[in-house]
Interface confidence: low
């Protein structure tokens, strides 16, 4: 359905404030370094152009597409050249390159400075002043930070984060009401970044194929009451969605989320009866909600997937005729199958039934070629339930931060050449998958922890794509998406690296570790602990347990102190000299 | 490039043993599971015996405690200990590594039982 004017179409579809909201994210997410109120201003640009082709859709210029618009507008900010370099290169080419080139200088990791909270009543008199402004800049600090946000999702969280403030200001203990509210938003944003970076890693890395594949089996997963058609109906439209967002185009991803959602709440009888509650909720908590919905029961009475897929004699007339469809039927029928099954594993299994196929339909006898093709599957399937009944074990032995020590060493021995605040950051979430899965019964597992480890391992692959340092990274991160894992797990100690020198300087701490939170301590620590791995990797766990003894025994003698800054600097240096001794460095 | 040589075939009584080989070579890491298959004469190829990357293994009914699957990180070789065998167990033994970058075949081993 064509539009005279694509522009005023969003604008009269998503309301003025929805519209301001994706305009500012999509600027923010593109030039994350501008300063919030050119952002503001440039968005205010747009917003009064829009209502000119409201009025009128035939006015000059209200036919560009909305590249075009944003391209042209974003390429008016003067300092472009002296901020962003080369990407001001980007204004030279003619759409759709230039929105393209604009993509490939998204940052993943843009140098700015660490969001501060200031005192709550700070926050209460700023946001009582001018909550619009104070929304706003709210938006802006997430997007420029993570220039993949989910747009319409982060549309939710200010609308929950405003909901905290209106409430909290208003509180006896304003801080009591709020900071929990806050703490709960970051984490949850943070945790939602990371689960849409990999969506949008795995359409630009791999293909729209790889994304619809992931899509059919946690939807099948999900919806396990609805067709197959009706999972590839909602498939088709999921993958239009997130291409959207993850080329740019957020007010079409938008206004694509609310068309999905009002389609699935229509249709939710043949969809899912977990639907009911989402379906009663306001537009931004309906689709979040969607989004999150548990898995329905399973039909009773599943016929064995071996009569269509092994024991047929048509499967090879069946694979030929459509084959991306027989597959994406097979993985449909496994999966809903298995709501026990991570969605990488079943990406795996259909793998290797496709690689079986591609194989046995060429044999002289196929049927024969393929008929043991569900033996094959087992030990696939073991793999990763070993892995993850071993590192349960672990972290209920040691507590996460112990267990993120352990996988510290680990990561840090497979790939040293990995900077020290990437090894830290990741391994600290892999580290997570202990308190987030490992409390589940058996049958909620494997899906939370291999899925939630592929977000995580996704995190190392689009930060290490920015400065390549490691060829084993490089090769597990491109070579195969639903093997990433696999590939991490199997590396050994890299004996080809060189330690690096000794560096008294990194070992060095003063009285300001005393004042920062536990978690921010914890990750000094968890820094040192990677620096000496780098320096000592063939290190044992006994060497190194008994050096971060000394190391936790050290801050928290000289915290208690009278005189830390001495203490930290007499004992400081026993320490070093005990740690190489140690070591044998 | 994974490269795999298979040895240790022969021909052995029944009851007698064998111990096959596979020496893997070239770009070998990032494997996530190792397996020995094997082709009688006029069938297909059967799984025989599998190790994951954490050492868990599968075996297939036919062969489940008389053959055991092992692997030497350090050498980068997978073996096969075959005992108790049986004129059923003649075929051509094949080794197959995956890892990250595909699914590698040996050229195989002729194991033949007979008196």
């Known amino acids: 359905d064509a539009h005279k004017s694509e522009v005023a179409h969003r604008f009269k579809d998503l309301g003025e404030e929805n519209f301001k909201a994706l305009v500012l994210i999509a600027f923010a997410q593109y030039l994350q370094q501008c300063p919030f109120e050119d952002h503001v201003k440039l968005v205010n640009e747009v917003t009064e152009f829009a209502k000119t082709c409201v009025a009128d859709e035939s006015a000059e210029n209200c036919d560009k597409s909305l590249h075009t618009l944003f391209g042209d507008k974003l390429c008016t900010v003067a300092t472009l050249r002296e901020t962003y370099g080369e990407m001001a290169d980007c204004c030279a080419k003619q759409e759709p390159e230039r929105n393209e080139c604009f993509l490939q200088h998204k940052d993943d990791n843009p140098n700015l400075p660490r969001l501060v909270r200031p005192e709550v009543d700070v926050m209460c008199t700023a946001f009582h002043d001018n909550e619009e402004t104070f929304l706003k800049k709210y938006l802006y600090e997430i997007a420029r930070r993570h220039p993949y946000f989910y747009a319409p999702e982060l549309l939710f969280f200010a609308k929950r984060y405003k909901a905290a403030f209106t409430e909290c200001c208003q509180a006896a203990d304003k801080a009591a009401c709020l900071l929990p509210k806050l703490d709960e938003l970051r984490d949850e944003g943070k945790a939602s970044s990371a689960k849409q970076r990999l969506k949008c890693a795995s359409l630009q890395k791999f293909g729209e194929r790889a994304f619809k594949a992931w899509a059919v089996a946690r939807l099948s997963q999900r919806f396990p009451k609805a067709e197959f058609a009706e999972v590839s109906k909602l498939v088709t439209d999921l993958t239009k969605v997130h291409t959207e967002c993850c080329h740019g185009d957020l007010l079409e991803c938008a206004d694509d989320r609310a068309d999905l959602a009002k389609y699935i709440c229509e249709n939710q009888d043949s969809i899912s009866s977990k639907l009911k509650e989402c379906c009663e909720k306001p537009l931004l908590e309906k689709s979040h909600c969607i989004a999150e919905v548990e898995n329905d029961e399973m039909p009773a009475d599943l016929p064995s997937l071996a009569a269509d897929f092994v024991e047929s004699k048509d499967v090879c007339k069946n694979y030929a005729e459509a084959k991306d469809v027989f597959l994406g039927m097979f993985l449909y029928e496994y999966a809903r199958r298995h709501p026990d099954y991570s969605v990488v594993l079943l990406l795996r299994l259909a793998k290797t039934y496709e690689t079986t196929l591609e194989k046995c339909c060429a044999a002289a006898d196929p049927h024969e070629c393929y008929a043991k093709v569900f033996d094959e599957f087992k030990p696939l399937v073991e793999e990763p339930q070993n892995l993850i009944k071993q590192n349960c074990e672990l972290f209920e032995q040691l507590g996460e931060y112990k267990f993120q020590n352990a996988l510290l060493v680990r990561y840090t021995k497979k790939v040293p050449q990995v900077s020290t605040p990437t090894l830290v950051e990741v391994s600290r979430n892999l580290g997570k998958v202990g308190s987030k899965c490992c409390k589940h019964p058996e049958a909620k597992r494997m899906p939370c922890a291999e899925d939630y480890l592929s977000v995580v391992l996704n995190q190392l692959c689009v930060l290490h794509e920015k400065t390549p340092v490691s060829d084993r990274v490089t090769k597990c991160c491109t070579e195969s998406l639903v093997n990433r894992r696999p590939c991490f797990s199997a590396l050994e100690v890299d004996e080809t690296y060189v330690p690096k020198e000794f560096n008294a300087e990194t070992f060095t701490f003063h009285a300001d570790i005393c004042t920062l939170s536990e978690k921010e301590r914890q990750i000094k620590k968890q820094t040192a602990l990677v620096e000496l791995v780098k320096h000592k990797p063939k290190a044992t766990k006994e060497q190194l347990k008994a050096v971060m003894d000394d190391f936790a025994a050290f801050v928290e003698k000289c915290c208690k102190a009278d005189d830390k800054e001495t203490c930290f600097a007499e004992e400081g240096k026993k320490l070093v000299a005990a740690s190489q001794a140690a070591l044998g460095l | 490039q994974v490269q795999l040589v298979e040895s240790g075939g022969g021909l052995v009584q029944p009851g007698g043993s064998l111990r096959l080989s596979c020496s893997a070579s070239g770009s070998i890491w990032g494997i996530y599971h190792m397996g020995w298959y094997r082709q009688a004469p006029g069938k297909q190829r059967e799984l025989v015996a599998s190790?994951?990357?954490?050492?868990?293994?599968h075996y297939a009914d036919t062969v489940k405690g008389r053959f055991t699957i092992s692997r030497d990180n350090s050498k980068n070789t997978l073996y096969l200990q075959m005992n108790s065998l049986e004129p059923e167990d003649t075929a051509v033994y094949y080794c197959d590594i995956r890892n990250v970058g595909g699914d590698y075949w040996g050229q195989g081993t002729q194991v033949t039982v007979s008196s």
């Open positions: 190790i994951t990357v954490d050492g868990s293994t």
